[in-house]
């Protein structure tokens, strides 16, 4: 396909652009360029005739265009007015036209910008700073960079004046950074030199690291203090209120139980005169303590909640271990360990995640185990199941239905008959039932913790007479030699015998016929067209029997190899050729004919009047069954002799 590529697409004023032609057809008469998206004569820039290799200017020619033999167009010394679409019109030697449109945009070059500021040393949480990008330039986009990153989203940052001005309200220490502005258009981008904003702040409450407060006897204690501050803070350490040293780090080698106590770090900012302190309590153990498990959620909800189990206490240089169901942790995408193995997170808990869970702390000689923790996962209720599964009962028997739904806490059950509440029990018992007890029996399971309810409805029919059964099928249109069909005799009834008939006869013995489900289900494997029969099921008990209406199996088959009639293959000139094609198929196939490979008509009968030797050749009948997706064909050779030349030939139809 003929296409135009503008190189470049965005062009700087004064530069040049090449409208590059791709897929130029061969055998050309000529081509012509136009300003705009149409081939209008008054917008012609330049035309080129291949035969004469002559380029001739048009009404829109400016003197800055050069056309090349490959049809590409160079436009030099670009001006703003050159922006827009350009159309190439190609006339091929066969005088067929092709057109393609390209476009480019023109922009000016930009000068290097600079930043002006209204405050060079603002105070945190007090001052505002306004930066302005100079100079003001038309058709330019203004961008701002903080530490060479684009602007963060913040309600304290406001762009105004077409993004030329950046205002920082209530400056914070995080605003201490290198600020640059940039002017951009599609052909140039210029960045200013950086302006450093120096915000005075602090000190904040110091942080003592590492965070762990439990140590073993004999270890080294190395505490570091840091407080955010500008200018940087000066630090002092106190142990149990007694001054120790004026350093940022406190180091005590080979600690003992006597080094347990409160450790205070004080940070001081000489510019603001402010002091802040932080205290941590350090415990030194002679031996590791027995671990215990804490949980962030004691009653998680299935498929909703995550649970984080943490092994306490936090001890430096310690290995943490976990067990679930007295086994080491299984590999699962729902189980995640923290970097130090101290926290085990179960994502999207399930009812199978109850545990027990144990954690351990390993020392040189042994592993100390925590007590086991069991999760109480709330779930359900699932859809309740009503048993037994019978739907037909005889009068006089006892009806005993039981309902169960998986649930934690255990579900509360209610029974309804025909929508009317009966009782709040798991089991429903009705003695000596009559026809009046027929109806819709609903079991409702409710989980009081989650507030969720689920119901199951069962139709109960009480009748001395068995109902007329019906046949349900899992496949109404099976394909021969491919599909299986399962017939099921409905309904399921108590103390009932199920029987089957095919075409009024009892079931034939066949490895393709299988009875299951107490003879309620009849399965035909690998159906054939011969299985397209009337199937009847029957139910009987000691007092009654009944048969279903017949269900006829509609087996899709074929098309078989077609037969062309009549069988004659030799004809006399002048006879009528009347060929009929037939193929066994369900549903009936679609027919089509080809003579010497050339498609003819989509009919079952092919009729040609007064044939001649020109009608010699191969006659193919094609059959296709859209339902089975299968096709078939047959080919017949027909010879037509001139009249009287070959005695004994058929005279045709």
């Amino acid at each position: 396909k003929l296409t135009i590529e503008s190189t470049p697409f965005n062009v700087a004023e004064g530069k040049e652009v090449l409208l590059l032609v791709h897929n130029l057809p061969q055998h050309l008469f000529g081509y012509s360029w136009y300003k705009g998206e149409r081939v209008d004569g008054n917008r012609q820039i330049i035309g080129y005739v291949i035969g004469t290799q002559q380029a001739t200017p048009g009404p829109a020619y400016s003197g800055r265009e050069i056309i090349y033999p490959n049809a590409s167009l160079l436009i030099q010394n670009i001006i703003q007015n050159d922006t827009g679409f350009y159309t190439l019109h190609v006339i091929k030697s066969d005088l067929v036209n092709e057109e393609a449109t390209g476009q480019f945009r023109v922009y000016p070059e930009l000068p290097k910008p600079s930043i002006s500021s209204n405050n060079s040393k603002p105070v945190e949480d007090k001052d505002a700073v306004a930066f302005t990008c100079e100079p003001e330039t038309q058709d330019a986009t203004y961008l701002w960079w903080v530490n060479n990153q684009s602007l963060p989203v913040s309600p304290r940052l406001q762009l105004s004046n077409g993004n030329r001005t950046l205002t920082l309200f209530n400056v914070t220490r995080n605003d201490t950074a290198s600020y640059k502005c940039e002017t951009q258009n599609p052909v140039s981008a210029r960045r200013s030199d950086s302006v450093i904003l120096n915000v005075l702040y602090g000190p904040d409450a110091p942080t003592i690291s590492p965070l762990n407060t439990s140590y073993r006897s004999g270890e080294n204690l190395n505490l570091s203090c840091h407080a955010a501050s500008n200018p940087p803070a000066q630090y002092s350490w106190f142990v149990n209120g007694t001054f120790q040293q004026s350093t940022q780090e406190l180091f005590i080698p080979n600690i003992t139980v006597n080094n347990s106590g409160s450790y205070t770090c004080q940070a001081h900012n000489s510019d603001t005169g402010l002091n802040r302190t932080t205290v941590t309590t350090i415990t030194v153990y002679a031996e590791p303590p027995k671990p215990f498990i804490t949980s962030n959620n004691s009653n998680p909800v299935e498929d909703e909640d995550a649970v984080a189990l943490t092994c306490e206490p936090e001890i430096q240089n310690t290995t943490y271990l976990w067990w679930v169901n007295n086994q080491s942790l299984p590999v699962s995408p729902r189980l995640q360990l923290s970097n130090d193995n101290r926290t085990l997170t179960l994502l999207s808990v399930t009812r199978n995640d109850v545990g027990p869970y144990e954690c351990g702390i390993q020392n040189e000689l042994s592993v100390d185990h925590s007590d086991p923790v069991i999760l109480n996962v709330l779930y359900g209720p699932d859809d309740p199941t009503i048993s037994p599964s019978y739907t037909y009962y005889r009068p006089g028997v006892n009806l005993s239905l039981s309902c169960h739904a998986a649930s934690n806490p255990p579900a509360q059950y209610s029974w309804l008959i025909d929508g009317n509440i009966q009782q709040h029990t798991q089991e429903l018992f009705i003695s000596n039932i009559t026809e009046k007890n027929s109806g819709l029996y609903t079991c409702q399971a409710n989980n009081s913790a989650s507030g969720h309810s689920r119901t199951t409805v069962k139709t109960i029919t009480v009748s001395a007479e068995l109902p007329k059964p019906s046949i349900s099928s899992n496949n109404s249109k099976p394909v021969e030699d491919k599909d299986a069909v399962a017939f099921t005799c409905e309904p399921e009834a108590q103390n009932t015998t199920y029987l089957w008939w095919v075409n009024g006869q009892s079931l034939p013995v066949s490895p393709r016929l299988q009875l299951s489900n107490g003879n309620r289900t009849l399965t035909l494997f690998n159906v054939t067209r011969n299985d397209a029969r009337a199937y009847v099921c029957g139910i009987q008990n000691s007092v009654s029997a009944n048969r279903s209406d017949p269900v006829t199996l509609d087996v899709l088959y074929g098309p078989d190899t077609p037969i062309i009639s009549p069988p004659d293959s030799s004809y006399l000139s002048g006879a009528n050729l009347n060929l009929s094609c037939h193929s066994a198929s369900n549903p009936s196939p679609q027919y089509s004919w080809r003579i010497n490979g050339i498609p003819q008509q989509h009919t079952q009968v092919l009729f040609i009047a007064k044939i001649t030797p020109n009608n010699n050749g191969t006659y193919a009948c094609f059959v296709s069954n859209l339902a089975t997706g299968r096709n078939n064909s047959i080919v017949k050779s027909i010879t037509v002799s001139a009249s009287g030349t070959s005695p004994g030939l058929s005279a045709g139809a």
Epitope: Q44, G47, E98, E99
Partner: antibody, heavy 116, light 111 residues
Framework: QVQLQQSGAELMKPGASVKISCKAT????????IEWVKQRPGHGLEWIGE????????DYNERFKGKATFTGDVSSNTAYMKLSSLTSEDSAVYYC?????????WGQGTLVTVSA | DIVLTQSPASLAVSLGQRATISCRAS??????????MHWYQQKPGQPPKLLIK???NLESGVPARFSGSGSGTDFTLNIHPVEEEDTAYYYC?????????FGGGTKLEIK
Amino acid sequence: QVQLQQSGAELMKPGASVKISCKATGYTFSDYWIEWVKQRPGHGLEWIGEILPGSGRTDYNERFKGKATFTGDVSSNTAYMKLSSLTSEDSAVYYCATGTTPFGYWGQGTLVTVSA
Amino acid sequence: DIVLTQSPASLAVSLGQRATISCRASQSVSTSSYTYMHWYQQKPGQPPKLLIKYASNLESGVPARFSGSGSGTDFTLNIHPVEEEDTAYYYCQHSWEIPRTFGGGTKLEIK
């Protein structure tokens, strides 16, 4: 091959609006202008305007500005012309056409009859 | 707008003879490389059919008895020899600018 299939004939009341469709097949619909041409019974051809479906760019004959509105749906390869405030003067056969300039492919035409 | 004037409005030509249809533009529609004039044929109940593009280029599939000539403002469509099937209306159209106007049409009958 290139084909333009236009919508069927329309009988409209004066003052009403009608929207004629032109479904294109056999080429890249978005890349070529669709022209609209009017022919009143027993009269010649009158150029209404054109649309480039890919960009939605339109050009109208001044005589038809406010009368005709062109739209294009690239997803269904269909161009539309809406004629508003119909009068008896708008009774005509309307054609769509396309191809590289000039226009070698035409729809079969849509007859619009305006009658009280 | 460019006005295209066709003449004659109708003509009758004997089978096998030459038919000549003229189209005059109110301003030039030619550059030094191209002429932006085209000819269409329209039969009753049918859309127009492109015959000649750019004044003299025969559209693919159009019989060679059709020919076009002219530049600037004066253009001619010739049909020789005319055949029965050439009975139709013939229109010229320019593509010099927007709007692209058509000529008033010429009705050709075969005697």
